[in-house]
């Protein structure tokens, strides 16, 4: 509440994240031009990434384009791509929707249709949809332990949200434990009225606000956080602003003296953990 | 303005960005003695990071050292590194500006030069000047989508740049399209008074700054971003205190049982997303 | 100090680390069967990651998992996880401690154990204790260049921590030159009252707060910053709530067709930069 | 000049083997996809095989499960293995490359072509 006679000082805040689950991936796997079912288990090391304090990201869903190299391949026949001859391939040209520079020539991309030949990573990523439903789906049973240390320097006051007193085997409920800092992540987004099983298939960005409202004076002395979840990213987002959530990342290797590299596209959620708050005191 | 009756309340932000182009990179290769023009493609995945939240790094330059290996190998001749006799070579000593640890030994680096023989990351990197012009200075053309959610908890307020209306093809212009939030990078230079050729033969860090100054009073509601642009780094810094922006990293390998890496001292430019302001409220 | 007629305004900030040092590890190593004592070099791209703004992370220790490759392999024999019949394993069941997930067999993990057979990266992480002392225990010595950027954009002013006077081969201390950016992370640690060789091999958080305190008022004006260290993690934290500061990353690699990955679980230091303050004009 | 130069062929039983090989040379950029045609007395030029610079391989139905191509970029060059010959495999082969002659310069470069004959 808000004391008009006390010096309010807003906070300073450092956050630790901790990630726990396994997933079970099962995906068709082609080789050799044959198709099989693949069966793949992904841990921490395998779906979240080394991030800096205020933001962890969770993988649930992936594009792989394996076995690139650079050279030249008949670009993706996206909408609008196609060609019939030469004079529609411009060379040096790069459209922004494709992933390489024209080289000038209209070339086969299968037996039906020719598009623009490119110098790029080939073949080039097609453009297809995040699988349905989300390969890492069971993500939603991941939990997630927050770390919180605050300060209010004016105040000389630290604290943080974990207490000597708490129990490392706790999961946060709203009603029953709203002190716990390991969250479900599944129960993450069902406070945000959110619907995880969905989000997971293209990515999305979910905010934890860790709100503290300190009351310093020691005669009525209260300093713990409150919880709250909402999502950041818009989900009525149109195509062109890229809805979801997703990135590309790139592993390199070389293999008959050429360098190659798998290409993920990504799609996960990203977590933003927002602190915020005061501490007043006399 | 300024409306002192109001209740002010600093902005709870979230931003997502996204990255898009690509570069052509034309560059002198060196393989088995002989030297050829080497050509590659780079998109997304190969010159940007996954970064979480506030920052975004586009590299626009690089330096390579391929094929280090763990062992021994006389340091890098620069100004003051030489010696003549193994006097001058300390064992166990680490030169804040060498790349390993000295053995005592006074070692040929090429006809002419005798440095310290060191243990380290072999042959060392050698100390030569960032590419000049950038080898990814094409990066001008890329754009970059901004996407920000903000907050405003105690006015229990949440809106976002991107709305409905927009149109996902614009690009940013001060006077033009003032509320477009896909920018190009050559764009936030010129409005910087920055020159984008220059900065990114050495890296920089530009930030982006996004003010809101919102008054959520319902009979005279406004709560849209202004955008402006300013250098962020020191562009006249002295030598020792490491201008530009650069950060080196390493790709591993194997080859013949010996591990190997390929390190890339990568330069570019690291942007800066700065969400201020306040709402108000009577 | 506080002058209530001014018009306060918080501190907008950008940061920019550098760190320096080399690391010279001895552990052993078996290959073949035969244990011998390794001896490597760790520069920058080796131990610390490249990372955005307010944090940076440097690598003091860490255990290594090779050659792991997705298989069925009997699950690491922690306390309560051996069984003596399949009636103990569950098939499909994952343990939140375990890495894999069970296929409901009991099977010999050695000579004297059995535990749950599981689906996993195998062979499964050992959970062994991190190396004692740390394996980059020298990381003391480390210097960490720190590059701060401020702004008040209501009084239109600017200004960074580093003045064109200062000598890029200073060490900060706190009484004799408290201006210098330039700081050694054992003094660091030291400044506040920790111990670096005993948190390197845990890992753990360390902030670095930088308070500007501006008065701009033309005839009175000071606005320079002041730096302190506090360590953010709780040293006295709960085995069941993390302590310390690791995370696990993994370098992907094929091997006779088959991709397997080698597992590094990294402890370290990271360090938040926190900067706060205020701008004060008439 | 830019050359393909086709070496392996000649007369074979059928069940018998041959490998074909096609190297590159003069002065270019890089060396893309690189395929084997055939042609038949009296028919029209059809792919055996073709593989990309990253080794990815496409074959003829014919061809499927007998023939392998294979390359070395080292050398700039294609090989086919021919495994399995049969009678209906007599033809001219002929290497196909398409080469970058500099940066986004690409020509369909033909080798002479090599004969292959294989008796019952």
């Known amino acids: 509440s808000d004391k008009l006679y006390q010096r309010k000082e807003p906070v300073i805040s450092s956050v630790h994240t901790k990630v726990k689950g396994i997933a079970e991936v099962t995906e068709n796997v082609t080789e050799g031009g044959v198709t099989k079912l693949g069966h793949s288990i992904f841990d921490t090391a395998d779906y979240t990434f080394p991030l800096q304090g205020n933001s962890f990201f969770v993988m649930t869903n992936y594009v792989k384009s394996e076995g690139q190299v650079q050279t030249l391949c008949p670009e993706y026949p996206r909408r609008g791509a196609q060609c019939s001859s030469d004079r529609r391939c411009k060379k040096g040209w790069m459209d922004p929707q494709s992933k390489g520079i024209q080289t000038g020539r209209c070339v086969p991309y299968d037996k039906t249709r020719k598009t623009c030949e490119v110098s790029a990573w080939c073949p080039t990523e097609e453009e297809k949809e995040a699988p349905r439903p989300a390969l890492l789906r069971s993500a939603e049973n991941f939990t997630v332990l927050i770390k919180n240390n605050i300060h209010f320097p004016g105040h000389n006051y630290t604290t943080r949200n974990i207490l000597p007193t708490m129990n490392g085997s706790c999961t946060f409920h709203k009603t029953w434990d709203p002190q716990c800092s390991i969250f479900r992540l599944g129960d993450i987004f069902q406070e945000a009225g959110e619907n995880f099983t969905e989000v997971a298939v293209q990515g999305g960005i979910m905010g934890i606000e860790i709100y503290w409202d300190c009351n310093l004076d020691s005669w009525s002395h209260h300093c713990r956080p409150r919880y709250s979840f909402r999502r950041l990213d818009d989900k009525n987002m149109d195509e062109s602003f890229v809805p979801g959530y997703n990135f590309r990342y790139a592993k390199y290797y070389k293999e008959n003296n050429v360098e190659k590299r798998t290409l993920i596209k990504a799609f996960g959620i990203r977590f933003d953990i927002l602190v915020f708050g005061t501490g007043g005191k006399f | 303005s300024d409306k002192l009756y109001q209740r002010k309340e600093p902005v709870i932000s979230s931003v997502h960005t996204k990255v898009k182009g690509i570069a052509e990179v034309t560059e002198n290769v060196t393989e088995g003695g002989v030297t050829k023009l080497g050509h590659s493609i780079f998109d997304t995945a190969d010159y940007t990071f996954p970064l979480q939240g506030n920052s975004f790094f586009v590299m626009t330059n690089y330096v390579k050292s391929e094929g280090q290996v763990q062992t021994l190998c006389p340091e890098y001749p620069r100004r003051g590194a030489q010696c003549s006799s193994d006097r001058r070579c300390k064992k166990g000593w680490m030169d804040p500006q060498s790349k390993g640890i000295q053995t005592g030994r006074c070692v040929p680096y090429d006809k002419t030069r005798k440095t310290c023989e060191v243990s380290a990351w072999c042959p060392t990197e050698e100390e030569k000047e960032a590419p000049r012009p950038a080898l990814l200075r094409s990066a001008e053309n890329f754009t970059v989508l901004i996407k920000n959610n903000i907050h405003f908890p105690g006015h229990n307020y949440t809106t976002r740049n991107i709305l409905p209306t927009m149109n996902g093809s614009c690009t940013f212009h001060k006077t033009w399209d003032p509320q477009c939030s896909i920018f190009r990078l050559g764009d936030i230079f010129q409005e910087a008074g920055e020159n984008f050729t220059e900065v990114a033969v050495q890296g920089g860090i530009m930030g982006i700054e996004i003010y809101w100054d919102c008054n959520l009073d319902s009979w005279s509601h406004h709560c849209r971003p202004r955008y402006s642009f300013r250098r962020l780094d020191d562009k006249n810094m002295d030598e020792s205190f490491v201008p530009g922006y650069n950060f080196r990293y390493a790709k591993y390998y194997k080859e013949n049982n010996v591990e190997k890496r390929t390190l890339i001292k990568a330069f570019g430019i690291r942007f800066d997303i700065l969400v201020f302001g306040t709402g108000g409220k009577f | 100090s506080d002058k209530l007629y001014q018009r306060k305004e918080p501190v907008i900030s950008s940061v920019h680390t550098k760190v320096k040092g080399i690391a010279e590890v001895t552990e052993n190593v078996t290959e073949g069967g035969v244990t011998k004592l390794g001896h490597s070099i760790f520069d920058t791209a080796d131990y610390t990651f490249p990372l955005q703004g307010n944090s940076f992370f440097v690598m003091t220790n860490y255990v290594k998992s090779e050659g792991q490759v997705q298989t069925l392999c009997p699950e690491y024999p922690r306390r309560g996880a051996q069984c003596s019949s399949d009636r103990r394993c569950k098939k499909g069941w994952m343990d939140p401690q375990s890495k894999g997930i069970q296929t409901g067999r009991c099977v010999p993990y050695d000579k004297t154990r059995k535990t749950c057979e599981v689906s996993a990266w195998c062979p499964t992480e050992e959970e062994k204790e991190a190396p004692r002392p740390a394996l980059l225990r020298s990381a003391e010595n480390f210097t960490v260049l720190i590059k701060n950027n401020i702004h008040f954009p209501g009084h239109n002013y600017t200004t960074r921590n580093i003045l064109p006077t200062m000598n890029g081969s200073c060490t900060f201390h706190k009484t004799w030159d408290p201006q210098c950016s330039i700081f050694r992370l054992g003094d660091i640690f030291q400044e506040a009252g920790e111990n670096f060789t005993e948190v390197a091999v845990q890992g753990g958080i360390m902030g670095i707060e930088i308070y500007w305190d501006c008065n701009l008022d033309s005839w009175s004006h000071h606005c320079r910053p002041r730096y302190s260290f506090r360590r953010l993690d709780d040293k006295n934290m709960d085995e069941s709530f993390v302590p310390g500061y690791n995370f696990r990353y993994a370098k992907y690699y094929k091997e006779n067709n088959v991709e397997k990955r080698t597992l590094i679980k990294a402890f370290g230091i990271r360090f938040d930069i926190l900067v706060f303050g205020t701008g004060g004009k008439f | 000049a830019v050359q393909l130069v086709e070496s392996g062929g000649g007369l074979v039983q059928a069940g018998g083997s041959l490998r074909l090989s096609c190297a590159a040379s003069?002065?270019?950029?890089?060396?893309?996809?690189m395929a084997w045609y055939r042609q038949a007395p009296g028919k029209q030029r059809e792919l055996v095989a073709d593989?990309?610079?990253?080794?990815?391989?496409n074959y003829a139905d014919t061809v499927n499960g007998r023939f392998t191509i294979s390359r070395d970029n080292v050398r700039n060059t294609v090989y086919l293995q021919m495994n399995g010959l049969r009678p209906e495999d007599t033809a001219a082969y002929y290497c196909?490359?398409?080469?970058?002659?500099?940066?986004?310069?690409?020509?369909?470069?033909w080798g002479q072509g090599t004969q292959v004959t294989v008796s019952s």
């Open positions: 196909y490359a398409v080469i970058e002659l500099g940066v986004l310069e690409p020509r369909d470069y």
């Open positions: 593989i990309t610079r990253g080794d990815r391989t």
């Open positions: 003069g002065n270019f950029f890089r060396v893309n996809t």
